[in-house]
Structures are given as structure tokens and as C-alpha cells.
């Protein structure tokens, strides 16, 4: 079995997560990609994904995340802005190429959100100023609804598949609650 | 073709503004963050300032903060440099540069701007 | 913020030669590491993203390693038009930085 890998961020509320998903650009360019929370004991769940075929560059934003995928580098970046303690938990990028389940990208993020004043946004480690001039907006696409034959008792392997529907949408205030992924980096 | 062209440079004096632009062409401009990055005389790079695609998020270097201003024109397919107060060490080459997620892709020209009494 | 050290500041060199530069960032970035080309009076151009992955057009004389904090750039067999300043810019943690520069001169 492949080893998972976990790359940790600590981080204040308000900062911003900023992370980069990596693919063979060759491979996976146009593909639909998604971002993912995995809950102990539960399949991953989609919480945004770009558009599909999966626009250059192109920012998709649901909420708080927004998705840029860069396909001449292979390349997906993830931010989740003004974070909540709510949102702390066990992220990952996927691939959707259906039929087959999705495909993990490695690392997966373990996120850490703590109270304490953060006078702005910043991401990774570091404090930097940003100006937000208007609120996020949300960007509508499709996510594919996966189901998986198999039972998950604990932090699901690589090749676990997403279930959520086609036209769910996530609960704005806090990421970490999945009610519904809007169709729409 | 990718195409970034600067202009807007010249001599101020300390404590003067002056509003850099970059012209894009060749690619969707709205759909990349863009970056200032500049130049000292003789010294290495550093970044300045960039934009998201829609302009809703600005962030800058340290010593430009509450002093320079970076904005966009989708429509004009422009990045603009807004900069007041100016030092002498702000003295530098000015380069509009495009974000790619992991690396400044391509880059302008360049713009002098020269900070001198 | 992070801070990316290159070294040798400069290296005289000659055709032909194999150069190699490092960079060492102040903490971790992954493999988010780039390499830039400025020649006297140009813009800087990429050369090396994602510290291997070679930038379309670059000549495959140019490669990239490392992860981390340690990187090099290597120039197998150096051409006259390779005299040049070269950069490294970190873009894992914001902002994005650069190493001082390395100065590859004719010998």
C-alpha cells in the first residue's frame, strides 16, 4: 500500500490557506480537478472543483475556496480565505477521471486554524498585507457525484471516491460543513 | 505572442507619485493574477505588489505599503502601478510580470523610475 | 518571510564548462522553487519551474534539482549566450522571493 503523506499549515483565523497540487501536466492538463475534506470514518466530500474541461488558469471560486489551475505547469493552486477555526482538518486534490475513482494527489493537507489576531490575511506563515476591495463571489461548475462499493471505518486510502451530488452547495460560514458543491479556480 | 509592455517611468522627486502601466496582449489577461516586480541599479529582484484576476485582492511588499497602489482594467487589458511618497530607494526598474502559480512567466520590458532631487 | 541564499555570488567560467549554482531557502518549500536568465538590460526569463520541470523553448543544457530547502541549477555545457545573472525565486510562502543572484562570467 502506498504511504499517505500529510503536509501540515498552521495557521490564525482570517489567513488564508495557499497551497499547490501538482499533476503530470500530460496527463491530467484538462481534467477536472477538486478539493477535498476527509472526516475520520467518512468518504472524502467536495468542497469546489474547476470546471470541466478544467479552465487555464481560470479562477473558480465557491465561498472562501478558490481554484486556479495552471495546466502548462501541471499545476493547481488551492486558497482558502479568512480561515475559521471550523475549518481545521485533513485536506486533499483529487482528479476526477471517470469512470474510474478519483485520483489523489499528494500531499494531503493536514490544516490547523487557531483563534488569535491576525491583523490580515496572509498565507503559509507569513502575515502580508491584502486589500479586499469587494466581497468573494461564487463561481458556479459542475462536480461529478462518485459512489464507492466500500465501507470506510477510517481515514479512507488513496483511491477513495467522493459522494457528493451533483447539485450540492456548501454552507458559506463554514467550509468544514457540507451541505449541498454549487454547480459553477 | 505574450506581450507585456511597461511605460510611465521616469525622474520624480522624493516625496513625488507617479502611475506605472502595462499593456498586456496574447493571452486572457482577467484570468491571471499580475505582479510589479522591480529592480535597483546594479541589485537582485524583488517583488512589489500583485492583483487577483478580478482585482478584489491587493497585496504588496512591506516598504511599499500605504505608498503605492497596484490596480487593473480587465476591459483594457492594463495593470497599473499607483506611486506616491516616493524614496530614492524606490529607485529601480519597474517589470509587470504574469503569475503562473508557481513562477513570474513572462515578463515586461521594463520602466525606469528614478527618485532623485 | 523566506529567505532564499544563492551561492556562489559569481563564477567565472568558460565554454563548454559545467556550472552549477545552488540556493538554499531559510525553511521548507517543497518543490516550489524557479530559475531565472537576466541578461545586462533585459527582463529576467524562466528557465526552470517546479525546481526540475523545464520551461518550453529553454535548451535541455539547463536542469534543475532539489526539494526542500536545497536546490541547484545546472548548466551541462556552457554556451556563450549563457553568460548571464541568475535568480531563484521561491513561491511557496508569501511573498514570493528571491535569491540575490548568481553572476556567470567568461573565465
Known amino acids: 500500500a502506498t504511504k499517505l503523506t500529510e503536509e501540515k499549515y498552521e495557521l490564525k483565523e482570517g489567513q488564508t490557506l495557499d497551497v499547490k497540487c501538482d499533476y503530470t501536466l500530460e496527463k491530467f492538463a484538462s481534467s477536472q480537478k477538486a478539493w477535498q475534506i476527509i472526516r475520520d470514518g467518512e468518504m472524502p466530500k467536495t468542497l469546489a472543483c474547476t470546471e470541466r474541461p478544467s479552465k487555464n488558469s481560470h479562477p473558480v471560486q465557491v465561498g472562501r475556496i478558490i481554484l486556479e489551475d495552471y495546466h502548462d505547469h501541471g499545476l493547481l493552486r488551492v486558497r482558502m480565505v479568512n480561515l475559521q477555526v471550523e475549518d481545521s482538518g485533513l485536506y486533499q486534490c483529487v482528479i476526477y477521471q471517470p469512470p474510474k475513482e478519483p485520483h489523489m494527489l499528494f500531499d494531503r493537507i493536514r490544516l490547523v486554524v487557531t483563534k488569535g489576531f491576525s491583523g490580515t490575511p496572509g498565507s503559509n506563515e507569513n502575515s502580508t498585507q491584502n486589500v479586499y476591495k469587494i466581497p468573494p463571489t461564487t463561481t458556479k461548475a459542475l462536480c461529478p457525484l462518485y459512489t464507492s462499493p466500500r465501507t470506510v471505518t477510517q481515514a479512507p486510502p488513496k483511491s477513495t471516491a467522493d459522494v457528493s451530488t451533483p447539485d450540492s452547495e456548501i454552507n458559506l460560514t463554514n467550509v468544514t460543513d457540507i451541505i449541498r458543491v454549487p454547480v459553477f479556480n | 505572442e505574450v506581450q507585456l509592455v511597461e511605460s510611465g517611468g521616469g525622474l520624480v522627486q522624493p516625496g513625488g507619485s507617479l502611475r506605472l502601466s502595462c499593456a498586456a496582449s496574447?493571452?486572457?489577461?482577467?484570468?491571471?493574477?499580475m505582479s510589479w516586480v522591480r529592480q535597483a541599479p546594479g541589485k537582485g529582484l524583488e517583488w512589489v505588489a500583485n492583483i487577483k484576476q478580478d482585482g478584489s485582492e491587493e497585496y504588496y511588499v512591506d516598504s511599499v505599503k500605504g505608498r503605492f497602489t497596484i490596480s487593473r482594467d480587465n476591459a483594457k487589458n492594463s495593470l497599473y502601478l499607483q506611486m506616491n511618497s516616493l524614496r530614492a530607494e524606490d529607485t529601480a526598474v519597474y517589470y509587470c510580470a504574469r503569475d503562473y502559480g508557481d513562477a513570474f512567466d513572462y515578463w515586461g520590458q521594463g520602466t525606469l523610475v528614478t527618485v532623485s532631487s | 518571510d523566506i529567505q532564499m541564499t544563492q551561492s556562489p555570488s559569481s563564477v567565472s567560467a568558460s565554454v563548454g564548462d559545467r556550472v552549477t549554482i545552488t540556493c538554499r531557502a531559510s525553511q521548507g518549500i517543497r518543490k516550489w522553487l524557479a530559475w531565472y536568465q537576466q541578461k545586462p538590460g533585459r527582463a529576467p526569463k524562466l528557465l526552470i519551474y517546479a525546481a526540475s520541470r523545464l520551461q518550453s523553448g529553454v535548451p535541455s543544457r539547463f536542469s534543475g534539482s532539489g526539494s526542500g530547502t536545497d536546490f541547484t541549477l545546472t548548466i551541462s555545457s556552457l554556451r556563450p549566450e549563457d553568460f548571464a545573472t541568475y535568480y531563484c525565486l521561491q513561491a511557496h510562502g508569501f511573498p514570493w522571493t528571491f535569491g540575490q543572484g548568481t553572476k556567470v562570467e567568461i573565465k
Open positions: 496574447g493571452f486572457t489577461f482577467s484570468s491571471y493574477w
